[in-house]
Amino acid sequence: EVKPCDFPEIQHGGLYYKSLRRLYFPAAAGQSYSYYCDQNFVTPSGSYWDYIHCTQDGWSPTVPCLRTCSKSDVEIENGFISESSSIYILNEETQYNCKPGYATAEGNSSGSITCLQNGWSTQPICIKFCDMPVFENSRAKSNGMWFKLHDTLDYECYDGYESSYGNTTDSIVCGEDGWSHLPTCYNSSENCGPPPPISNGDTTSFPQKVYLPWSRVEYQCQSYYELQGSKYVTCSNGDWSEPPRCISMKPCEFPEIQHGHLYYENTRRPYFPVATGQSYSYYCDQNFVTPSGSYWDYIHCTQDGWLPTVPCLRTCSKSDIEIENGFISESSSIYILNKEIQYKCKPGYATADGNSSGSITCLQNGWSAQPICIKFCDMPVFENSRAKSNGMRFKLHDTLDYECYDGYEISYGNTTGSIVCGEDGWSHFPTCYNSSEKCGPPPPISNGDTTSFLLKVYVPQSRVEYQCQSYYELQGSNYVTCSNGEWSEPPRCIHPCIITEENMNKNNIQLKGKSDIKYYAKTGDTIEFMCKLGYNANTSVLSFQAVCREGIVEYPRCE
């Protein structure tokens, strides 16, 4: 017998429309109901809602709402979770890895946590550790492979070796930056005694009785003596390396400064030569500066003579540069000897070697060259054609040849052409036109003509202008355009009205304010008439203001 299912009590969720549905329970096997899960819980399919089914064995799924854990709830210092999921369901496990130099509490590089009914099983932990170090002439006293922060590792030296004066055991400590030092023991016979003394000099530190191998000691010379060789000696195989020598410094003669002088040089001259280490202020002449770019500085007496060796350097001024169609963007106005300055050419201009920028150098006699920016043209856009040459930049007056694709031409029958680089760019565009889209001469019009001499053939988009004869009114556009082998609609020339003395006499009228025998009016013009002396109007007042309409005018009449 099929057992019915009682109303399902869903932990951490519920049926949709619970109170309405409660009345229909118990339910027969085969029935299904939609249900939802509370926050932090999902259906076995990972959704927040699904269907619960009444089966022969009761409700399915048996656990409709499963606990979820969020990756964002995991705080992991010095480690990371590499998996991409952000939500994990009940009993699901996720791996975490510790950063290099860190390990789990068990000493592993990675660990795992599990999503349980009350959240994550534990917060992952990554602890600072130190690897077993490399021992030199020594061995560790303990056997671990991982050492936590502040852990101590004792070591002992092999026979005939010691860590420091007479000690054969020592300890190292695991710190934030690794081991406090390396567990190294030295051959006792390789220690050194005090470093050797040198004439006119001494060590910078107080000498000890014993120095370990690879110890370093620094020397310094007395005043007016210069150190020659390395200032350090190193203990190796029980001996010190070669110590330096302290050499007496040579004196300096009075400095003859080209393009400059010592301050108070006449006063100072008697005191020369002088010992090394002495310094004197000096200045440079106009258009010259010290190596630091100032007009004055100090000159120093050294073992090798005066420093700087060239106290006064030539300067070049930005204002001496004439650069047409270009500019110098650097802000300095003065440049010293051998200093290079960049200049840029304006758009559409380039250096002689075709670049957009160049450089000049300040030499002993001034600038190396005057910068030059020459007009150039870029490779143009080809329309139904291709270029013959390969340059990207073309100088003023350069010619560029091009050829048309099949079915295209430049002008009547021509399939190759040239363009010239001019002051305003290319002479024209390298365009080829579809032969079938060209037009013949534009159509003639009555009482008018084109303003230009007619050609046999016109390329697409050519425009031709029309004009009418005197007194004829142009109606429509005064231009026609060639498109798809046809000209657009040409304009019309509308007849003028000719006001004759004969017609005026017939109607006993004359022009108002005019004494013309013959008068021409354009379409739309108003012509004012009046009765001749001794005659009166026989038509309406309005008829005396007649309008010209395409060559026809209605005359008023006087009797």
């Epitope: 013959k388 073309f394 694709y405």
Partner: antibody
């Protein structure tokens, strides 16, 4: 490495239209000109024409009335159609690349395909 | 059309000896705007497509041995193989790309004596 591969029927009847396709792989298709060149058995090389990726063409005037060269940039292919073929059109047909946008030399060639015109 | 004429039609040279092929164009292929000669040399081995050796009359293509060199300007050009090797046996073609239609020389067959 740029590779060109010709494909099409090896035998065509007289007076019919011959169709060949060249597929380009391993390099850019745009920015170049793509040519057809043929070589009758035991003879020299004859340029048939080129096509630009934009569709612009130029053909040898000696064949122009019979030649159609087209391009399909979506497939990196270009094609040759030669109409009203005769036995004189029997040749190995090569496709080749002209190196640059301007007039240039042929730096890559296909292996060639032999087309025989016979009834 | 620009006609390209090669001489000789065939050439037999001993291994290690110099081989010289001439090419003459019916009009100049020197383009004044960039001072370049629009001429290339190719060689073709049996059953293979032509292979580019020299372009701009004298520039060797990448990977081509330096025993191959090109010279000349305007209408007269020369391809020289300084020391012939067995693998150089082929038909050699010159080609102009100055104008359309592109045209090739009739070819020069190089063999070992």
């Amino acid at each position: 490495q740029v590779q060109l591969q010709e494909s099409g029927p090896g035998l065509v009847k007289p007076s019919e239209t011959m169709s060949l396709t060249c597929t380009v792989s391993g390099g850019s298709f745009t920015g170049y000109y793509w040519s057809w060149i043929r070589q009758p058995p035991g003879k020299g090389l004859e340029w048939i024409g080129y096509v630009h990726y934009s569709g612009g063409t130029k053909s040898n005037p000696s064949l122009k009335s019979r030649v159609t060269i087209s391009v399909d940039t979506s497939k990196n292919q270009f094609s040759l159609k030669l109409s009203s073929v005769t036995a004189a059109d029997t040749a190995v047909y090569y496709c080749a690349r002209e190196r640059y946008e301007w007039n240039s030399y042929f730096d890559y060639w296909g292996q060639g395909t032999l087309v025989t015109v016979s009834s | 059309d620009i006609v390209m004429t090669q001489s000789p039609d065939s050439l037999a040279v001993s291994l290690g000896e110099r081989a010289t092929i001439n090419c003459k164009s019916s009009q100049s292929v020197l383009y004044s705007s960039n001072n370049k000669n629009y001429l290339a040399w190719y060689h073709q081995k049996p059953g293979q497509p032509p292979k580019l050796l020299i372009y701009w009359a004298s520039t060797r293509e990448s990977g081509v041995p330096d025993r191959f060199s090109g010279s000349g300007s305007g209408t007269d050009f020369t391809l020289t193989i300084s020391s012939l090797q067995a693998e150089d046996v082929a038909v050699y073609y010159c080609q102009q790309y100055y104008s359309s239609p592109r045209t090739f020389g009739q070819g020069t067959k190089v063999e070992i004596k």
